[in-house]
Every structure is written in structure tokens, then in C-alpha cells.
């Protein structure tokens, strides 16, 4: 028997369902009584789900997994993982045994989009050209860690005087805070881009200083 899985990682959003695809080619006359199917975590060998002795043995992994019972006889050994969490990330191995056996591993990459950044300034009033200001860009509840890029109004990257920190929360998601210290010109726009490297999702925030007063662009 030959087992086939996707070579590319499966990307799943936190709190959504994911399908880890695994298939085999059943011989003519194949019946489910002949099938032994085991899904396990590749590295720790922890059992996730199994089908043996002609029946679904159920989930051994936080009761959030399921097979596709009606499709097993056609060679579809895929695993459904419900309400994906950060802790689910990793490699899963699909073992199929009929008369001989084969196995293959598929990787699950978990992701969560970052929120639209909020922008704050310090100081936020009586600003004059030549003043040093601190602009903070904050974006929340993403996974994995974000990349942050700053640009001025002409699109020129701002890399000096930038400090970015990631903060992990109880669910394993990250809040990102990036601080730009800059000397104000007569007027100007400063924008930050928070990128989720897995989703290639960009979240933008910007602040514009046009003499007085200070203005924030409207929400997109």
C-alpha cells in the first residue's frame, strides 16, 4: 500500500477546522475490516486518531479529531481537526496498514491574522518641526510572530530608532508593539505595516502630522 499526503504544509487559522489529507489506493475487493489506520504526532508518537478492527476507535487527542468514514473505503484516510489551536501546530504522521504498510507525514502550520494597528504619539500635542516624537504601532492576537516595517510619507523605509517587541498571551498568540522615534519635519506621514509571515497578511496603520492639529487617517 502507498500512502500519499500533501508535501506543502497545511495552513489553518486559529479556531477554524483543518483537514490533513492522506490517501491510499485500495486493491479490488478491499474492505474496511482489513484496514488499520493510525494518525499520530510525528515527533512524540502521541496517538491522535485510529481506525482498527473494522471500526473508528475515535479521537485520542482532545476530542477534536474525526475521520471521513464514508470515504475510507475509497482510500481517503484524511483527518479533520476541529477548532485549531496554536498547540496543534507540528507534524502528523498517517500510517496505513492493509497487508503491508506505509506512512507519510504532513505538517500543520497554524496562523492567526493580526488586527489593524492602532497608532499612538507621545507627546500628542503642541508638536513643532524639530520635535522628537515617539510613534507606537500596536497590533494584536496574531500568530506566528510578526514582521514590522515603517515608512515615511514618500514610502522610504525607516529602520533607525525602531524597537519592536512581541508579547505572548495565554493562547500562544502574539501582540506586537513597535516604537519609532523620529524628529518631525514640517509635516509628514508615518506608517507601519505589520506582516503575518505565514498568511502574507499585511495590516497597515498610519499617522499624519500636518502642522496643527494632528490627524489620524480614518479607518479603512
Amino acid at each position: 500500500v502507498e500512502v500519499q499526503v500533501s508535501e506543502d504544509p497545511v495552513v489553518a487559522l486559529v479556531d477554524t477546522d483543518a483537514t490533513l489529507r492522506c490517501s491510499f489506493s485500495p486493491e479490488p475487493g478491499f474492505s474496511l475490516a482489513q484496514l488499520n489506520l493510525i494518525w499520530q504526532l510525528t515527533d512524540t508518537k502521541q496517538l491522535v486518531h485510529s481506525f482498527t478492527e473494522g471500526r473508528d476507535q475515535g479521537s485520542a487527542y482532545s476530542n477534536r479529531t474525526a475521520l471521513f468514514p464514508d470515504l475510507l473505503v475509497q482510500g481517503n484516510a484524511s483527518l479533520r481537526l476541529q477548532r485549531v489551536r496554536v498547540t496543534d501546530e507540528g507534524s502528523y504522521t498517517c500510517f496505513v496498514s492493509i497487508q503491508d504498510f506505509d506512512s507519510a507525514a504532513v505538517s500543520l502550520q497554524v496562523a492567526a491574522p493580526y488586527s489593524k494597528p492602532s497608532m499612538t504619539l507621545e507627546p500628542n500635542k503642541d508638536l513643532r518641526p524639530g520635535n522628537m516624537v515617539t510613534i507606537t504601532c500596536s497590533s494584536y492576537q496574531g500568530y506566528p510572530e510578526a514582521e514590522v516595517f515603517w515608512k515615511d510619507g514618500q514610502g522610504v523605509p525607516l529602520t533607525g530608532n525602531v524597537t519592536t517587541s512581541q508579547m505572548a498571551n495565554e493562547r500562544g498568540l502574539f501582540d506586537v508593539h513597535s516604537v519609532l522615534r523620529v524628529v518631525l519635519g514640517a509635516n509628514g506621514t508615518y506608517s507601519c505595516l505589520v506582516r503575518n509571515p505565514v498568511l502574507q497578511q499585511d495590516a497597515h496603520g498610519s499617522v499624519t502630522i500636518t502642522g496643527q492639529p494632528l490627524t489620524f487617517p480614518p479607518e479603512a
Epitope: D43, T87, E89, A105, S107, P144, T164, S165, Q166, V198
Partner: antibody, heavy 120, light 108 residues
Framework: EVQLVESGGGLIQPGGSLRLSCAAS????????MSWVRQAPGKGLEWVSS???????FYADNVKGRFTISRDNSKNTLYLQMNSLRAEDTAVYYC??????????????WGQGTLVTVSS | EIVLTQSPATLSLSPGERATLSCAAS???????LHWYQQKPGLAPRLLIY???NLASGIPDRFSGSGSGTDFTLTISRLEPEDFAVYYC?????????FGGGTKVEIK
């Protein structure tokens, strides 16, 4: 059995470059965040850099712009390219595997380390 | 950056005694993201306790951890000869991910 084996350390002059390697085995390397942590002689541990499974990298401020972390998932190998080396970069460099969120991102396996000495 | 200050720097005790090591954070750290490592001379660090109080695989139960907020403690109930080493706390709550300066537990 999980194994991490560093190599590439040595004596280098200030301003010089060096590339460290870390060969990983016994686990699915491509799915883990990997890090470099260093330890100056007689001192404590200092995080240097981390790289996500897909290649996105993060650095400590004191190495940003000089060091580049990378990985080759097909070769199960982690790298650290170190340029513009300074005397204060002298340390044993360890590669470490960051465990998943069920262990709250602790570094559960470490290599034996490779010594980098920056001196004229 | 979160600074972790370990005390004492050196702890001189005899086998069989109880060891209490402290780790103080400059700002609050989620107890989930506070870890402890053990390092013996010439060897790499090894994970001892994760998330303040959970023993890593293969670590004997004479080791325990506690604490919250800014104050964390590692306790070794009865020191065995192999426990004499340097111990580091680490936080993964906020980048840059930082380590304490270490506490050396030496034989009295």
C-alpha cells in the same frame, strides 16, 4: 533521539566573518522555531536570534544588521552568518529548539555549543 | 526589555539540604512563560521547569517551581550531588527573550 550539533566556531579577527552551522536530527526540523543563544566566558546566557519555520527571522538589538540567521529545511540545518565581529561577540554559541505552545515556548533541546573567539 | 535578576549569585549548601533560588522580573511576566534551566560546567543548558512549575521530561520531583507576577522561585527539596550546577530563569513573555544572570549552587 533529538540531536543538535553545532560547528563552525574558531578564532577570528575583529571585523571578520564566520558562519556557524547546527545540524539537527531526531525530529521534524522544518516545523520548529529554532534559536541561537550565546554565553560569553564565565557569563550568563543571552538570546541572539530566532527563525520561524518559514524563514522569518528576529534578532537581539546588539547583533541586528551584523548577524543573519537562516535555515535549510531540506538539510535539517540551521545557520548563523556573523559579520563585522567584535571582541564582545566572543562566546560559546548554542543552537536550541523552541518547543511548541504546550510547553509555552521553552527551549527544550540544546546543542553542545561552538566557541567563537574574536581577537587580534 | 524585561530584566531578570537572580539571587543569590552563589548558594553554598551541603547534599541533602534544601535550596531556594529566586528570580525577580523588572516587570510582570505571565507565569506560563517563565522557565528554568540547569547548566553543568562545560555542558549545554537543559530545560528543567517550564511555565513556572511544570517539570520537563526526565526531571526528578525534588525540583519544583512557584511564583507569579515579578517573583519566581525554584526549589530543590534535597540536594543530590548531581544538582550542583548553575541555574537560569528565562522569560518568553515579551521579546527580547531574556535570561537571568544565574545562580550557582555549589558544595559547601
Amino acid at each position: 533521539e533529538v540531536q543538535l550539533v553545532e560547528s563552525g566556531g574558531g578564532l577570528i579577527q575583529p571585523g571578520g566573518s564566520l558562519r556557524l552551522s547546527c545540524a539537527a536530527s531526531g525530529f521534524t526540523f522544518s516545523t520548529y522555531v529554532m534559536s541561537w543563544v550565546r554565553q560569553a566566558p564565565g557569563k550568563g546566557l543571552e538570546w541572539v536570534s530566532s527563525i520561524l519555520s518559514g524563514g522569518t527571522s528576529f534578532y537581539a538589538d546588539n547583533v541586528k544588521g551584523r548577524f543573519t540567521i537562516s535555515r535549510d529545511n531540506s538539510k535539517n540545518t540551521l545557520y548563523l552568518q556573523m559579520n563585522s565581529l567584535r571582541a564582545e561577540d566572543t562566546a560559546v554559541y548554542y543552537c536550541a529548539r523552541r518547543y511548541g505552545h504546550d510547553h509555552y515556548y521553552a527551549m527544550d533541546y540544546w546543542g553542545q555549543g561552538t566557541l567563537v573567539t574574536v581577537s587580534s | 526589555e524585561i530584566v531578570l535578576t537572580q539571587s543569590p549569585a552563589t548558594l553554598s549548601l551541603s547534599p541533602g539540604e534544601r535550596a531556594t533560588l529566586s528570580c525577580a522580573a523588572s516587570s510582570s511576566v505571565s507565569s506560563s512563560y517563565l522557565h528554568w534551566y540547569q547548566q553543568k560546567p562545560g555542558l549545554a543548558p537543559r530545560l528543567l521547569i517550564y511555565s513556572t512549575s511544570n517539570l520537563a521530561s526526565g526531571i526528578p520531583d525534588r525540583f519544583s517551581g512557584s511564583g507569579s507576577g515579578t517573583d519566581f522561585t525554584l526549589t530543590i527539596s534535597r540536594l543530590e550531588p548531581e544538582d550542583f550546577a548553575v541555574y537560569y530563569c528565562q522569560q518568553y513573555h515579551r521579546s527580547p527573550w531574556t535570561f537571568g544572570g544565574g545562580t550557582k549552587v555549589e558544595i559547601k
